[in-house]
């Protein structure tokens, strides 16, 4: 269930950004990475160091697949693992970090017009929690290659990075996902410190854009290494 | 600046009734969707219930299905929780938080709910 889920996570403690939120001086309210939790004079974010448990790679995040932990592994078994970057071995596209899509068993760079998408690839949902749609009725989305002349526009349901249109990324919304702007300079992000760490974050953030890369922020080096605010910085 | 304020909180036997307000000021982008979260002493914080504004879906946790209803209107930057047959397991600081399109995540003080035996 969902609750079981939540309390699989460990959370660490971020101290709270100087002058309100970051990138928001004197907000009332914080601005984190991922799903962040005011706790008393820290903020806490959710994010957990065992293997999360999955089905398919839609249940992963961003820079994630899922799939045995070990090679020829129980395959009733399986766990988000830490995206493959550009020529490493693929087996599917999901398995390519994004910005590359799988070809001939080696993770490529997509090229702008390229989408993963050729097969036809159906979301459906099924959770420990509820979820309905505000006007009563069940909802059952198909995502088809033939509906993608155009990409996604924010908002829209993804299955991953590639259906979304250029300077967005497919990020988790609740228990689905959908297009999100990709982050600029100076945003607030989130750093997966372990490989096949996996945030439960509800409300996912997207990576740093083109150039910029999740780094501690410069003011934040006095704290301890579990309590690091990460921005996006340029190379 | 974006600012969430809930209201609604307070002493209530159980069985009772209360409704939780979330009310979004300064908002200069649109929100992707909102959820109410709760922290109870000693606990973990645990997410309650969610409205996705952009899929038009809500969200519930088991522990509050069918008792707990979310609702709100974006266009009034306001979210809700309707929350009936109360237990004392639900005594908790309540949160509302924020899925924007800006790509901070907001999130506002809380408000104490105290459900007596």
């Known amino acids: 269930t969902l609750n079981s889920v939540l309390n699989s996570n460990a959370i660490k403690n971020l101290p709270p950004p100087l002058g309100g939120a970051a990138g928001h001086p004197g907000s009332a309210v914080s601005a984190a990475p991922g799903i962040l939790y005011p706790g008393g004079n820290k903020y806490q974010t959710i994010d957990n160091y065992q293997p999360y448990p999955c089905a398919e790679d839609e249940e992963c995040g961003t820079d994630e697949y899922c799939a045995s932990p070990t090679r020829g592994g129980d395959a009733g078994v399986q766990i988000c693992l830490a995206c493959r970057k550009r020529r490493k071995r693929c087996m599917r596209h999901a398995m390519c970090c994004p910005g590359n899509y799988c070809k001939n068993g080696i993770c490529v760079s997509s090229d702008q017009n390229h989408f993963r998408g050729e097969i036809e690839e159906t979301i459906t949902e099924s959770f420990g929690n509820d979820h309905s749609t505000l006007d009563g009725y069940s909802r059952r989305t198909t995502l088809s290659s033939k509906m993608y002349h155009t990409k996604g526009q924010e908002g829209s349901v993804c299955l991953r990075s590639s259906d979304c249109a250029s300077g967005l990324c497919c990020a988790r919304h609740f228990w689905s996902k959908i297009c999100k702007p990709v982050l600029k300079e100076g945003q607030v992000c989130t750093k997966h410190r372990r490989k096949g760490s996996h945030g439960l974050e509800i409300f996912q953030r997207c990576y740093c854009g083109e150039g910029l890369s999740c780094r501690i922020q410069k003011d934040h080096h006095q704290a301890s290494n579990s309590s690091r605010l990460h921005t996006c910085q340029r190379h | 600046e974006v600012q969430l304020v809930e209201s609604g909180g307070g002493l209530v036997q159980a069985g009772g009734s209360l409704r939780l307000s979330c009310a979004a000021s300064g908002r200069t982008f649109s929100s992707y969707g909102m959820g109410w979260f709760r922290q109870a002493p000693g606990k973990e914080r645990e997410f309650v219930a969610g409205i996705s504004w952009t899929l038009g879906r809500t969200y519930y946790a088991d522990s509050v299905k069918g008792r707990f209803t979310i609702s709100g209107d974006n266009a009034k930057n306001t979210v809700y929780l309707q929350m009936n047959s109360l237990k004392p397991e639900d005594t908790a600081v309540y949160f509302c938080?924020?899925?924007?399109?800006?790509?901070?995540?907001?999130w506002g003080q809380g408000t104490q709910v105290t459900v007596s035996s």
């Open positions: 938080a924020s899925d924007e399109s800006d790509a901070y995540n907001y």
